[in-house]
Interface confidence: low
């Protein structure tokens, strides 16, 4: 039989909690084996004091018997031929020799029934507090600060941590981020970064990245000073920030122990984030103006935000929804956050001019309206903050109310009317459609433009397929022309002001279908961009190619 | 107002799967940890598993372990229990909880519940 | 597993005390007032009470049971009451609850 106890001496510090273990081998008997401990005092070396028994509920001296009661000095088993006991505070009495013994179940003494050792208590000199965050300055006060840094920008603080225990004993200083009002100590005390007794730093779960990133430092400063940088504060940073210090020291089986933990707040950290700042407005109010005049709105971005810079930077669009129109609408212009401009989809060919004004003032401008252009606009402002490195990530985005913006209508209407020349047409001829059109309303210098399309029945039915674009002419004169069915010649032309032809020369039988007009009505602004002002579709125009008598 | 909004429940077949959707509004998910509870009837509240604020520490409740899958989206505010190889016993109305701390793991520490979607699993 | 009673009764304006022994440092209570329904947080983290919850409630802690108190019991207050604590293995737990009868 042999009993096993950890090498000694064991070096503990006062108040805080030990364990030592002790386990049994080659015993007989049950597997489930009893353990007595006993405490041998430096002042009574040969005296005993009954400490706690696995068997014997009565078994503590009286020194011992209310702290076993209450709890604090326990015997727990971890198997039948193992136990440790626990003491929770330990008390500068409590050093000197530890017998682990056990009774007997073998049929003959052999080997050793008891193990031995020597536990010496440490005084409690492990002191925490919380340092200015320079390398030098006055102690902090004796309350926790209360600090507010915005989103973005820089989170330092510092810690004083120190020990004068006589042994040879390593700290590890670790700081901590608790949610507000949260216990000092809970299970919810999140680690940022520590630095290990071997110097080594490392972070917590979330916060690993930002470390390996570089945007979350520790150094220690000196002998007892420790430094925690926390660059691009985020939402998620704010709470109650602690440190903790815990001194280790090496038992003689060459295993670490921990033996004192002391911990302080530091501040209490308000992060002001730039959602909860950000703030858009826009003017004049309600526009109403006529086509070809220039609209131009203002866009305002206010809060108690940092200036774009290092830590920030903003970007500001506006985006258009037609009346009527769910959603925020598409984009018309931006400025980024390196303050280049930029026209969104279906605005470039534009005379617009997106441009900063005044420090947090932009301005949209559009050189001539059209009545597309009427809808509700909002400015749109983004705030980033540059990350690690320089790498911005977007913290907030805030949009204007809408601004309504009426533009009149032309108040144009057309009407078309088309045909086929002759009635009746046979392959191998030409077929000659024509299109009359009528114009009411519109401003002076209004252009017509008109194009052919055709839909082709299949299996006898007119397909699903979209129309398909024949020819046409532009507003601009300039003959377009697109894809015939028969494949041959095609040609498109204006045979008086409001009257347009389209000719399909030699007709085949692939060139049978139902014809249709589009015009369109268009008028040219001060900036030389057109805009279409109306439309209208002509009724159905039916080619059918027939097959001459002597055709085989 | 903080809000949770369970949705996913309904009529599933043993052997199969469901995935169970919690929708926070009025409150950044990302700084709690959110759980999972469910009560079949007439019994009491049943822990069924917990996910950290960051996701990378979950727990599950030893009925469900090997089954279920806790999971979110901070940026969409969401949580989902995913829980496969349905069984009767796992009737009931299920509550999405959020606590008040983050990585805590603990049914101590909850400070609001969803209204609950009802789960029945039946052939 | 967390112990508490099955069943206390009380008079109207009496006080109650619901009690769960467990092994963690940590519980909370919920009141439903029918199966199916919400639960509702009375408190959390031993003695934390929310904003919206009457000062009637409060709970305590000593040792390893955690107690709730209600004084001035009202007839509304008739409800399940559970207990919630996390186990040895940090996995959530709730009591069976206890049903509130009032007289």
């Known amino acids: 039989r042999e009993v096993l106890v950890p090498e000694g001496p064991l070096y503990r510090v006062a108040g805080t909690a030990v364990s030592i273990s002790c386990n049994v081998t080659g015993y007989e008997g049950p597997a489930q084996q009893n353990f007595e401990w006993f405490l041998y005092r430096p002042e009574a070396p040969d005296t005993a004091l009954g400490i706690v028994s696995t068997k014997d509920t009565q078994f503590s001296y009286a020194v011992f018997k209310s702290r076993v009661v209450a709890g604090e000095v326990q015997v727990q088993r971890l198997q039948g031929d193992a136990v440790v006991l626990k003491i929770a505070r330990l008390q500068a009495q409590d050093a000197g020799i530890y017998e682990c013994h056990t009774p007997s179940t073998d049929t003959r003494y052999l080997g050793s029934y008891s193990g031995k050792v020597e536990l010496r208590v440490l005084p409690d000199v492990l002191q925490v507090s919380a340092a200015p965050p320079g390398p030098r300055g006055r102690q902090a006060p004796t309350s926790p600060p209360r600090m507010t840094v915005h989103e973005g920008q820089e989170l330092a603080l510092g810690c004083l941590a120190r020990t004068s225990t006589q042994k040879h004993t390593h700290l590890a200083v670790s700081f901590g981020r608790s949610v507000p009002e949260a216990p000092v100590g809970r299970s919810t005390l999140q680690e940022v970064v520590g630095i290990r007794s071997d110097l080594a730093v490392e972070a917590g779960a979330p916060y690993a990245e930002r470390l390996a990133a570089g945007e979350l430092r520790l150094g220690k400063e000196g002998t007892d000073r420790y430094r925690m940088v926390v660059g691009g504060a985020q939402a998620g940073d704010a709470g109650t920030y602690h440190c903790t210090a815990a001194e280790w020291i090496q038992d003689p089986d060459g295993s670490w122990a921990q033996i004192a933990e002391k911990r302080a707040v530091l501040a209490h950290v308000d992060v002001q984030t730039l959602s909860s700042q950000l703030a858009v407005t826009v003017g004049p109010g309600e526009r109403r103006i006529g086509p070809g005049e220039p609209l131009e709105l203002l866009c305002n971005v206010s809060g108690a935000l940092p200036p774009a810079g290092r830590h920030a930077a903003y970007s500001v669009g506006w985006e258009m929804a037609p009346a009527g129109a769910p959603g925020p609408g598409r984009l018309v212009a931006q400025l980024d956050t390196e303050g280049v401009g930029s026209l969104g989809p279906g605005y470039e060919g534009r005379h617009i001019a997106m441009e900063k004004v005044a420090s947090r003032t932009y301005r949209l401008r559009l050189e001539a309206a059209r009545p597309g252009d009427a809808g509700t606009y909002r400015c749109l402002a983004k705030a980033y903050v540059r990350g690690s490195g320089t790498r911005l990530r977007e913290a907030a985005s805030a949009r204007s109310r809408p601004l309504p913006v009426h533009v009149r209508e032309e108040g144009v209407v057309l009407e078309a009317v088309a045909w086929l020349a002759g009635g009746t047409v046979y392959r191998g001829e030409t077929a000659s459609l024509l299109c009359n059109i009528s114009v009411r309303g519109g401003p002076p210098g209004l252009r017509l433009a008109a194009s052919w399309w055709v839909e082709r029945p299949e299996d006898g039915e007119l397909s699903s397929v979209p129309a398909q674009l024949v020819g046409g002419v532009g507003q601009d004169g300039v003959a377009e022309l697109g894809v015939r069915p028969g494949g041959g010649p095609v040609s498109v032309e204006l045979v008086g002001p409001r009257s347009h032809r389209l000719r399909l020369h030699s007709l085949g039988p692939e060139d049978e279908g139902v014809y249709h007009c589009a015009p369109s009505a268009w008028v040219q602004h001060a900036d030389y961009s057109w805009y279409q002002a109306g439309s209208a579709r002509s009724g159905p125009v039916t080619v059918y190619p027939y097959m001459h008598a002597l055709d085989t | 107002a903080v809000t949770l909004d369970e949705s996913g429940g309904g009529l599933q077949t043993p052997g199969g799967g469901l995935s169970l959707v919690c929708k926070a509004s009025?409150?950044?998910?990302?700084?709690?940890?959110m759980q999972w509870v469910r009560q079949a009837p007439g019994k009491g509240l049943e822990w069924v598993a917990g996910?950290?604020?960051?996701?990378?520490?979950?727990a599950y409740a030893p009925a469900v372990k090997g089954r279920a899958t806790i999971s979110r989206d901070n940026g969409q505010s969401t949580v989902r229990l995913q829980l496969n190889n349905l069984r009767a016993e796992d009737t009931g109305t299920y509550y999405c909880?959020?606590?008040?701390?983050?990585?805590?793991?603990?049914?101590?520490?909850?400070?609001?519940w969803g209204h609950g979607t009802e789960v029945i699993v039946s052939s | 597993a967390l112990t508490q009673p099955s069943s206390v009764s009380a008079n109207p304006g009496e006080t109650v005390k619901i009690t769960c022994s467990g092994d963690?440092?940590?519980y909370g209570w919920y009141q439903q007032k029918s199966p199916g329904s919400a639960p509702v947080t009375l408190i959390?983290?031993?003695?934390k009470r929310p904003s919206d919850i009457p000062s009637r409630f409060s709970g305590s802690k000593s040792g390893s049971t955690g107690t709730l108190t209600i004084t001035g019991v009202q007839a509304d207050d008739e409800a399940v009451y559970f207990c919630?604590?996390?186990?040895?293995?940090?996995?959530?737990?709730f009591g069976a609850g206890t049903t509130l009868t009032v007289l």
């Open positions: 909880a959020k606590t008040i701390y983050a990585a805590t793991l603990n049914a101590g520490e909850i400070d609001a």
């Open positions: 009025g409150f950044s998910i990302s700084s709690y940890e």
């Open positions: 959390y983290s031993n003695d």
């Open positions: 919630g604590s996390r186990d040895s293995s940090y996995a959530g737990i």
């Open positions: 996910i950290d604020d960051d996701g990378s520490s979950r």
């Open positions: 963690d440092r940590w």
